[in-house]
Interface confidence: medium
């Protein structure tokens, strides 16, 4: 069954862009004019979950790659990873829970809360060139992003 997908670039609230630094890691850094096209484009799929006025369940894939952001427990800590999937199976309307994020709109910003691990969010560090990670909104970590629509 066809699944609704939209394409976006994400920047954190410090305007850091997200780039694919090795096959399975996203990093956040400031990009200038000539390397702006390095930032990843996300395919956002609207998937199984519990939508409400302020939360929409989505899955976040990397456009043109068989990679999805997923949340798993590693050494007792919820952890964000890029997971390779079978392109014949994904995306699908009913994704496994580890792929599902609650997209939460706060004013003009957006947050992505793990459906598997409530109150854990896709996060970036204040520092440059650090991996994107799953954080519990503590300290100086950044959980607010802006979304720039990209035509399909």
């Amino acid at each position: 069954v066809p699944i609704r997908q939209l394409h976006y670039r994400l920047r954190d609230e410090q305007q850091k862009s997200l780039v694919l630094s090795d096959p399975y890691e996203l990093k956040a850094l400031h990009l200038n004019g000539q390397n702006i096209n390095q930032q990843v484009i996300f395919s956002m799929s609207f998937v199984q979950g519990e939508p409400s006025n302020d939360k929409i369940p989505v899955a976040l894939g990397l456009k043109g790659k068989n990679l999805y952001l997923s949340c798993v427990m590693k050494d007792g800590t919820p952890t964000l990873q890029l997971e390779s999937v079978d392109p014949k199976q994904y995306p699908k309307k009913k994704m496994e829970k580890r792929f599902v994020f609650n997209k939460i709109e706060v004013k003009s910003k957006v947050e992505f809360e793990s459906a598997e691990f409530p109150n854990w969010y896709i996060s970036t560090s204040q520092a440059e060139h650090k991996p994107v990670f799953l954080g519990n909104n503590s300290g100086q970590d950044i959980i607010d992003f802006t979304m720039e629509s990209v035509s399909s």
């Epitope: 069954v1 066809p2 199984q48 979950g49 199976q89 309307k93 009913k94 829970k97 580890r98």
Partner: antibody, heavy 119, light 107 residues
Framework: QVQLQQWGAGLLKPSETLSLTCAVY????????WSWIRQPPGKGLEWIGE???????NYNPSLKSRVTISVDTSRNQFSLSLSSVTAADTAVYYC?????????????WGQGTLVTVSS | QSVLTQPPSVSVSPGQTASITCSGD??????AFWYQQKPGQSPVLVIY???KRPSGIPERFSGSNSGNTATLTISGTQALDEADYYC?????????FGGGTKLTVLG
């Protein structure tokens, strides 16, 4: 209030084609998936398949070769066709709505139609 | 073909807690749903997305799902809870139901 009302032939001979229709009253038709489920007498539930308003379908692999689900959005109706029936297809057949607000699960059901296959 | 396994029957005394399990390979990776069906009636959704309750379903119904097992728990079970209960999950491209559990409220 959403209501699903279903109808169709209740008695079939082996090798005939089962045809059932479900009409949806109340609520939007295009925002949901529409499903068929069956339950043989005294047994459990078996999911047959689903369709959306555009006509896109998913079927249970075990029934896929014999099943067609279609939709008529102008009438807010969807239908089930099951070919080459045998006694094993005797069951109560239910139509149901799959809603995004409950995680695409079956939140409203029709009243059920008993279909008996007998020579 | 994916399989969800439920005990055929569970018995409980009124006021006690009933637990009905549903097991399947990596079921905790998926969302689980539960339906109640009384004789001669259509099924009714009682738990969705592992642990959410639709409006109108009493608070005594709760759910959990991890590992290979989803569990429907009915606390303070009442006579009117006597029914068949079915778990359900999504298997790649189609829905799968468990075989059903008959809940008997004793006395």
């Amino acid at each position: 209030q959403v209501q699903l009302q279903q109808w169709g032939a209740g008695l079939l001979k082996p090798s005939e084609t089962l045809s059932l229709t479900c009409a949806v009253y109340g609520g939007s038709f295009s925002d949901y998936y529409w499903s068929w489920i069956r339950q043989p007498p005294g047994k459990g539930l078996e999911w047959i398949g689903e369709i959306d308003h555009s006509g896109s379908t998913n079927y249970n692999p075990s029934l896929k070769s014999r099943v067609t689900i279609s939709v008529d959005t102008s009438r807010n109706q969807f239908s089930l066709s099951l070919s080459s029936v045998t006694a094993a297809d005797t069951a109560v057949y239910y139509c149901a709505r799959a809603s995004p607000s409950s995680g695409w699960t079956l939140d409203y059901w029709g009243q059920g139609t008993l279909v008996t296959v007998s020579s | 073909q994916s399989v969800l396994t439920q005990p055929p029957s569970v018995s409980v005394s009124p006021g006690q807690t009933a637990s009905i399990t549903c097991s399947g390979d990596k079921l905790g990776d998926k969302f689980a749903f539960w339906y109640q069906q009384k004789p001669g009636q259509s099924p009714v959704l009682v738990i969705y997305l592992d642990n959410k309750r639709p409006s109108g379903i009493p608070e005594r119904f709760s759910g959990s799902n991890s590992g290979n097992t989803a569990t429907l728990t009915i606390s303070g079970t009442q006579a009117l809870d006597e029914a068949d209960y079915y778990c359900q999950a999504w298997a790649d491209s189609f829905e799968v139901f468990g075989g059903g559990t008959k809940l008997t409220v004793l006395g």
